[in-house]
Each structure stands twice: as structure tokens, then as C-alpha cells.
């Protein structure tokens, strides 16, 4: 009569859709020669197998190419490999060893496969820092994808100039040459599993290192409204005794170090202010002349100068004719 054997391990297995799972099966150690035949995996209640090594037997259309019997009688292996898992694979399965010439065979216990929603997301890795104008290789990887599954489709989305690099079953490389304006923009890697029709994505914000491109000086003069200087200015008239506040501002990432110098500084000159703010509480003859703001950055420096011209109050000048 029909002989029965127990599948080792759990009574149910869980797999995320689009991924792979191995349903373990070991043939009985005592297997009479006459019982030896082909291996068949069946969906509970079905007559057509989902996988078999019988060359004359058809398998279910739904599982063809995705379900495989891993047949190795020497190692007593009769496991079922499922790749590109789909929601409708959610069912109970059993294995049967049988020769078509024989009335009986060996039938295993049932095992349930539960197919859950895909929760894994791609990883995006960046080697070191992204520098403006320098190519960097970004890798989008799905290490949890099995090698034998249908290779996923990788898609990249970015405003930055990019080109596709090599890919494997589990990863895709994107070469990016970012520009200053790409800093803080989004980059998305989208991975589609065609075998199961599932798409996952991950989005990161680009952190692009770039040297200052623009330096500006905002001038606060007494109570009057501030005005901005965007380029070197030859002469700025200022009333003697007036309070002046010079605010230097520069872009760049990470932020540039701002410092103020009187005159046109040499590289190793000592600043009069180590911040972007220069307070001149009472403008006098000592303040007449050039002031320079330098924006220092590991990737390059930029500076802007303005020249102060002091207007003297008529009663304020000493001596006479």
C-alpha cells in the first residue's frame, strides 16, 4: 500500500513575494527498489504536479519554470525550490515518489507555504563623499534576492548627470558626476521583480561637497535698510562715526569658513574677524580702505572685497587755515 513519510522541519514556511524559498524534503532512508520512481510535488487537492523530474509529465502552467524539484537520491534530497514567489503560491504542498508502473508510492506529509508582502527595500551605498565635478559610483543592492530568481530590473532616477555601470543579479552601479546644484536633491533606486510583478524603491538625498560659488556682503548702515554687494566694489561712501555691520555670506558644502581681513590679505594673513560678521562700531580714518571677506573651503576658496570711503563731518575736522 501507499507508504507515508514525514517532512522534516516546520509545518509551514514564510517567503516574501518575489523572493525564493526552499521546501526541505528528505527521502526515507529505507526505500525499496521497486518503489523508486519519479518525484512529484503537488499542490494539495491537485492532480497535476507543480514540479517533477518525470520527462513525460506536464506541470502546472502557473508554476512552470518557478518551481523545481531538487532531485538527488544519493543525498536523499527531494526538496522543492520556489523562486519568484507569488501571492497565489500561498498553499499546502506535498511530495510523492512513484513509478507510473506501480500502484503505490511514497507520500510525504503536507507543508504550508505562506507568501507575504515584500518588506525588504533596496540599499543605496555611496563610497566616501560626493564631490562636485568628480565621478562617484553609487551601488543599489538587494542582497536578500536569491541568485536563482528572475533577475530584478533596476531603475535610477536623479537630476544629476549619471551613467549606468555594471550590474549583477543583486546590484546595479550608477556613476554620478554631481554639480553644486544637485546638493540636497533626491536620488531614487527602483527595483522591479518581473517574476512576481512587485516594485520596491529607496530614495536618498544627495550630499554634494562643493567649493563656494558665490560670496556676497550685506551691509547694515545705521538704521537704513541693508544692501547686498555681489562683486568687488571700488568705493563705498560711509559717514564718519557711523556704525557699520558687514555680513559675509557664501554657499558651498560643507559650509565654508568665513573670515574678514583688512586690505588684500596674503594666504597666511591674520583675520580681523573669524566669523562672517564684521562689526565697525564707529567708522573713522583707520577704517578707510579695503575690507576682504574670504570663504575658505577644502575644495577651493573665494573672496570678495569692498573699499570704504569715509565722508567727514564738517565740524569734525581739526585745525584751520
Amino acid at each position: 500500500q501507499e507508504r507515508r513519510f514525514q517532512l522534516e522541519g516546520p509545518e509551514s514556511l514564510t517567503v516574501q513575494e518575489g523572493l525564493c524559498v526552499l521546501v526541505p524534503c528528505r527521502l526515507p532512508t529505507t526505500l525499496p527498489a521497486s518503489y523508486y520512481g519519479y518525484g512529484y510535488w503537488f499542490l494539495e487537492g491537485a492532480d497535476v504536479p507543480v514540479a517533477t523530474n518525470d520527462p513525460d509529465e506536464e506541470v502546472q502552467e502557473e508554476t512552470r519554470g518557478r518551481f523545481h524539484l531538487l532531485w538527488d537520491p544519493r543525498r536523499k534530497n527531494c526538496s522543492l525550490s520556489i523562486r519568484d514567489a507569488r501571492r497565489r503560491d500561498n498553499a499546502a504542498y506535498f511530495f510523492r515518489l512513484k513509478s507510473k508502473w506501480m500502484k503505490y508510492g511514497y507520500t510525504s506529509s503536507k507543508l504550508s507555504v505562506r507568501v507575504m508582502a515584500l518588506t525588504h527595500r533596496p540599499n543605496i551605498s555611496i563610497p566616501g563623499t560626493l564631490e562636485s565635478g568628480h565621478p562617484s559610483n553609487l551601488t543599489c543592492s538587494v542582497p536578500w534576492v536569491c541568485e536563482q530568481g528572475t533577475p530584478p530590473i533596476f531603475s535610477w532616477m536623479s537630476a544629476a548627470p549619471t551613467s549606468l555601470g555594471p550590474r549583477t543579479t543583486q546590484s546595479s552601479v550608477l556613476t554620478i558626476t554631481p554639480r553644486p546644484q544637485d546638493h540636497s536633491t533626491n536620488l531614487t533606486c527602483q527595483v522591479t521583480f518581473p517574476g512576481a510583478g512587485v516594485t520596491m524603491e529607496r530614495t536618498i538625498q544627495l550630499n554634494v561637497s562643493y567649493a563656494p560659488q558665490k560670496v556676497a556682503i550685506s551691509i547694515f548702515q545705521g538704521n537704513s535698510a541693508a544692501f547686498k554687494i555681489l562683486q568687488n566694489t571700488s568705493s563705498l561712501p560711509v559717514l564718519e562715526g557711523q556704525a557699520l555691520r558687514l555680513l559675509c555670506d557664501a554657499d558651498g558644502n560643507p559650509p565654508a569658513h568665513l573670515s574678514w581681513f583688512q586690505g588684500f590679505p596674503a594666504l597666511n594673513a591674520t583675520p580681523i574677524s573669524n566669523t562672517g560678521v564684521l562689526e565697525l562700531p564707529q567708522v573713522g580714518s583707520a577704517e578707510e580702505g579695503d575690507f576682504t571677506c574670504r570663504a575658505q573651503h577644502p575644495l577651493g576658496s573665494l573672496q570678495i572685497s569692498l573699499s570704504l570711503f569715509v565722508h567727514w563731518k564738517p565740524e569734525g575736522r581739526a585745525g584751520g587755515v
Epitope: 500500500q1 520512481g37 520527462p55 513525460d56 532531485w71 537520491p73 544519493r74 507510473k100 508502473w101 506501480m102
Partner: antibody
Framework: EVQLLESGGGVVQPGRSLRLSCAAS????????MHWVRQAPGKGLEWVAV????????HYADSVKGRFTISRDNSKNTLYLQMNSLRAEDTAVYYC?????????WGQGTMVTVSS | DIVMTQSPSSLSASVGDRVTITCRAS??????LNWYQQKPGKAPKLLIY???SLQSGVPSRFSGSGSGTDFTLTISSLQPEDFATYYC?????????FGQGTKLEIK
């Protein structure tokens, strides 16, 4: 004890027919596939035919297809081989054997000689 | 049809020798290979099935290996009763063809 006993062999003229029988005992005959295998004098084994446990499925070697018919009677625990249009090259010891894809029990064989 | 080719056709060896007989299939037959021993005037006897499974009651000096198209029967230490003819047979698809046999003789 599992036993297979062939009978019906003998000398027959080319073109004539012969029916071999195989009586099975010691096992549930109706659960097993059965084979016929032959061996010409001084030659190797040649697989001839197989029949499923219930007789619904049969396969033959190309050399006998259309001339030989394998059948069984489970109520009598007997396997048959009907051989028609016999040729000289069918001369051999015919073994009845038990098994599915593996033959595990063999009978002692019966000699068939096709000669004019 | 699947053609089974055994080598060598005949082999001379002495008691205690290690002997290897090979069988090659014309196409992949997975592990569906059986080995039989036949002595003169006797019916064949099953030794190995499923390429490597030892039939009940067969001495452990007999072993089988292989998968796909290439298979081996090994007798680790020949005994006097092992001198016989050995046949491989594929049971992957009908017709279930035999190899031509390997006659093992006393040296």
C-alpha cells in the same frame, strides 16, 4: 517467498505465434509493474516490454513493437507475452521480472527458439 | 532511444582487487541507473538502483556512483563469487535499455 515462474517457451517456426506466461506468488501482484526481458544465446540482456500494475499503461522495445503484446490477469496473478510473427532473431531466454523503474525480482526464464 | 555503453567489455582481475566498471548514457538520465549481476545459466540479480542505492542483501563491497551521463560500479575487494557479467540499465525513459555487459574473469 517471492517467486516468478515462466512457462510456454519452446521451438516455433518463423512467422508463427507463441504465448508466454508468468505465474507470480509471494507478493501482491496487482500492485506491481511487470517486465519481460530477453537474452539471446551468448548475448546481453535486452529489455522487451513493461506493463503497469493495472494494465492501463504498456511500453515496448522498438524491435518487438506491433508484434508482441504484454498483458496481465491480476485475478490469476499471471503475466503474459503474446508473440506474433516470430523471427529467428527473437530466439532467446525470456525472463519475467517484477518492478517499476527498477527490476528487483527475476524469474528463471523460459527458452524460445524460432527455427524452421 | 537512450544508448548505454559499458567499458570495458571484459576484465581480468584477482581476488582482493579493487575493480571499477563504467557506464555512459547517450543523454542525461539523472540518477535512474541500475546495476545487475548475472552468473552463467542464472537470472540477473539487482545490485544497485538509483545509481548509488545498495539493494537489500547485497554485500557492502559493491557501490555505485554517478549522475547525468557517467556512472561507475565499484567492487572494493573482489571475492571469488563476484566473477560474473555485470549490466547497467537506464530506467529514465522507455525503452529501458541495458548496456552490452562487462564480463569479469579470474586472472
Amino acid at each position: 517467498e517471492v517467486q516468478l515462474l515462466e512457462s510456454g517457451g519452446g521451438v516455433v517456426q518463423p512467422g508463427r505465434s507463441l504465448r508466454l506466461s508468468c505465474a507470480a506468488s509471494g507478493f501482491t501482484f496487482s500492485s506491481y509493474g511487470m517486465h519481460w526481458v530477453r537474452q539471446a544465446p551468448g548475448k546481453g540482456l535486452e529489455w522487451v516490454a513493461v506493463i503497469s500494475y493495472d494494465g492501463s499503461n504498456k511500453h515496448y522495445a522498438d524491435s518487438v513493437k506491433g508484434r508482441f503484446t504484454i498483458s496481465r490477469d491480476n485475478s490469476k496473478n499471471t503475466l503474459y507475452l503474446q508473440m506474433n510473427s516470430l523471427r529467428a532473431e527473437d530466439t532467446a531466454v525470456y525472463y519475467c521480472a517484477r518492478g517499476g523503474q527498477t527490476i528487483d525480482i527475476w524469474g528463471q526464464g523460459t527458452m524460445v527458439t524460432v527455427s524452421s | 532511444d537512450i544508448v548505454m555503453t559499458q567499458s570495458p567489455s571484459s576484465l581480468s582481475a584477482s581476488v582482493g582487487d579493487r575493480v571499477t566498471i563504467t557506464c555512459r548514457a547517450s543523454q542525461s538520465i539523472s540518477s535512474y541507473l541500475n546495476w545487475y549481476q548475472q552468473k552463467p545459466g542464472k537470472a540477473p540479480k539487482l545490485l544497485i538502483y538509483a545509481a548509488s542505492s545498495l539493494q537489500s542483501g547485497v554485500p557492502s563491497r559493491f557501490s555505485g556512483s554517478g549522475s547525468g551521463t557517467d556512472f561507475t560500479l565499484t567492487i572494493s575487494s573482489l571475492q571469488p563469487e563476484d566473477f560474473a557479467t555485470y549490466y547497467c540499465q537506464q530506467s529514465y525513459s522507455t525503452p529501458y535499455t541495458f548496456g552490452q555487459g562487462t564480463k569479469l574473469e579470474i586472472k
